[in-house]
């Protein structure tokens, strides 16, 4: 699983790339995306 902390501190990533990774994780884990 990819934690929010990891994602928000992943340097050099675009905001869309973070959203992309969140959404891919959401589709698997069904976590709420808001």
């Amino acid at each position: 699983a990819v934690s929010e902390h990891q994602l928000l501190h992943d340097k050099g990533k675009s905001i869309q790339d973070l959203r992309r990774r969140f959404f891919l994780h959401h589709l698997i884990a069904e976590i709420h995306t808001a």
Epitope: S14, R20, F23, L24, H25, I28
Partner: antibody
């Protein structure tokens, strides 16, 4: 290996309905989001619908919202696309696709052709 | 509006190299995209995802002759030592989530011919 096999395509009149199926094997179906992508004859690809692993979340483009419904039966390892109020512009090969942790459409089926014509 | 632009065609001699371009709409120049290969009469195949910094992850069974790079709003797919089986349509795609809605768009594709 991942296998996705679509079925249910055929010729249908405008305004009628059709349900497509995608039988999945070679992986734990209930662990992944799934999608439908279509390709009109001689044209480009168009994303049609996406559903989360357990079926709780669904997503559609405006072109099909309110007419198409994506669903899944994890006990049968099967993905569905219910298509209502079909139009000529819905004529296409419909592919099902599986996500990975890295990307949306990592694995694709062979496709099933839907022809909407009177 | 999220838009991807691709040249309709490209060609290369057997064993040579070719570099394909997918251009993002200017306000989306930092976006990660995906590349797909579609051989004639076959379904699309995932090739790679490609980030703004040029880093990429390739799909199953993709030879290391395929590589990706980025510059500004341009995302490139390079094929070195091109082979007959590389003759195909190459399509880029990009997704985003906006206000809890998902959107995914594809480019028009570039048809690659091996001479």
């Amino acid at each position: 290996q991942v296998q996705l096999v679509e079925s249910g395509g055929g010729v249908v009149q405008p305004g009628r309905s059709l349900r497509l199926s995608c039988a999945a094997s070679g992986f734990t179906f209930s662990s992944y989001g799934m999608s439908w992508v279509r390709q009109a004859p001689g044209k480009g690809l168009e994303w049609v619908a996406t559903i989360s692993s357990g079926g709780s979340y669904t997503y559609y483009p405006d072109s099909v919202k309110g007419r198409f419904t994506i669903s899944r039966d994890n006990s049968k390892n099967t993905l569905y696309l219910q298509m209502n109020s079909l139009r000529a512009e819905d004529t296409a090969v419909y592919y099902c696709a599986r996500q990975t942790t890295m990307t949306y459409f990592a694995y694709w089926g062979q496709g099933t052709l839907v022809t909407v014509s009177s | 509006q999220l838009v991807l632009t691709q040249s309709p065609s490209a060609s290369a001699s057997l064993g040579a190299s070719v570099k394909l371009t997918c251009t993002l709409s200017s306000q989306h120049s930092t976006y990660t995209i995906e590349w797909y290969q579609q051989q004639p009469l076959k379904p699309p195949k995932y090739v790679m995802d490609l980030k703004q910094d040029g880093s990429h992850s390739t799909g199953d069974g993709i030879p290391d002759r395929f590589s990706g790079s980025s510059s500004g709003a341009d995302r490139y797919l390079s094929i070195s030592n091109i082979q007959p089986e590389d003759e195909a349509m190459y399509i880029c795609g990009v997704g985003d989530t906006i206000k809890e809605q998902f959107v995914y768009v594809f480019g028009g594709g570039t048809k690659v011919t091996v001479l």
